[in-house]
């Protein structure tokens, strides 16, 4: 028969055979032969492949740094990694949660709508035209442009989301 | 290596005051947001006050406000809270932060104790 050229799922093919994958939790220790089932062995104490697969290594549990203030929220398994939070108080800095923060800053463009507090983090919002933040702040809202208006003044530069307006004298050159 | 080191910490009467500090090292200080932390015995962290990087603005807690004032002097690198009024609820550890207020950089705080 005709050397297959493509698998059913959970096999691999190799070697012009379809050979079984190991199955989650296990790695690969020898390709299966026309007399053979592949062989697999399970993963080690902190280890685990969360696939079926065809590594020949397991993958290291992510290590929780107490001195990046991180604990572990859920231990792994050999089919599922480690998960890890920050301590009380603090905020992962990414869904990863590979660091935390005391709270996140909100970046020029956007105020701080809500304070962090220990179970949330800081809520930015963008500010909206009439205001701006030149800063990054975890406390600061976004501020209104000066009115040149009230000084007598004009505006000589626009303002953005991130500068405020430039006022100026008035043209007394006027018709 | 950036490193805040929180004094002034001690032991007052209800009513009393203390003037914390903060020394600043290893980053040009001026310009950053700096933040005061505490933390009560078997409570969570709470946000007390915050100054601007120019000390323009500043942040209070509800809890805080009318009793405490933030400052910072950038020619000596150093953060500051004044607290007056001080009550048996204000006993905690307090910690200055600073952006990106990474973990670590944390100091080892100063205990303040409000006990008659």
């Known amino acids: 028969p005709e050397p297959p050229t493509a698998c059913r799922e959970k096999q691999y093919l190799i070697n012009s055979q379809c050979c079984s994958l190991c199955q989650p939790g296990q790695k690969l220790v020898s390709d299966c032969t026309e007399f053979t089932e592949t062989e697999c062995l399970p993963c080690g104490e902190s280890e685990f492949l969360d696939t079926w697969n065809r590594e020949t290594h397991c993958h290291q549990h992510k290590y929780c740094d107490p001195n990046l203030g991180l604990r572990v929220q859920q231990k792994g398994t050999s089919e599922t990694d480690t998960i890890c939070t920050c301590e009380e108080g603090w905020h992962c800095t990414s869904e990863a949660c590979e660091s935390c923060v005391l709270h996140r800053s909100c970046s020029p463009g956007f105020g701080v709508k809500q304070i962090a507090t220990g179970v949330s983090d800081t809520i930015c919002e963008p500010c909206p035209v009439g205001f701006f933040s030149n800063v990054s702040s975890a406390f600061e809202k976004c501020h209104p442009w000066t009115s040149c208006e009230t000084k007598d003044l004009v505006v000589q530069q626009a303002g953005t989301n991130k500068t405020d307006v430039v006022c100026g004298p008035q043209d007394r050159l006027r018709a | 290596e950036v490193q805040l080191l929180e004094s002034g910490g001690g032991l007052v009467q209800p009513g009393g005051s203390l003037r914390l500090s903060c020394a600043a090292s290893?980053?040009?200080?001026?310009?950053?947001e700096m933040w005061w932390v505490r933390q009560a015995p078997g409570k969570g962290l709470e946000r007390v006050s915050a100054i601007s990087g120019s000390g323009g603005s500043t942040y209070y807690a509800d809890s805080v406000k009318g009793r405490f004032t933030i400052t910072r002097d950038d020619s000596k690198n150093t953060l500051y809270l004044q607290m007056n009024s001080l009550r048996a609820e204000d006993t905690a550890v307090y910690y200055c932060?600073?952006?990106?207020?990474?973990?670590?950089?944390w100091g080892q705080g100063t205990l303040v104790t409000v006990s008659s």
């Open positions: 290893g980053f040009t200080f001026a310009g950053y």
């Open positions: 932060a600073k952006e990106p207020y990474s973990f670590d950089y």
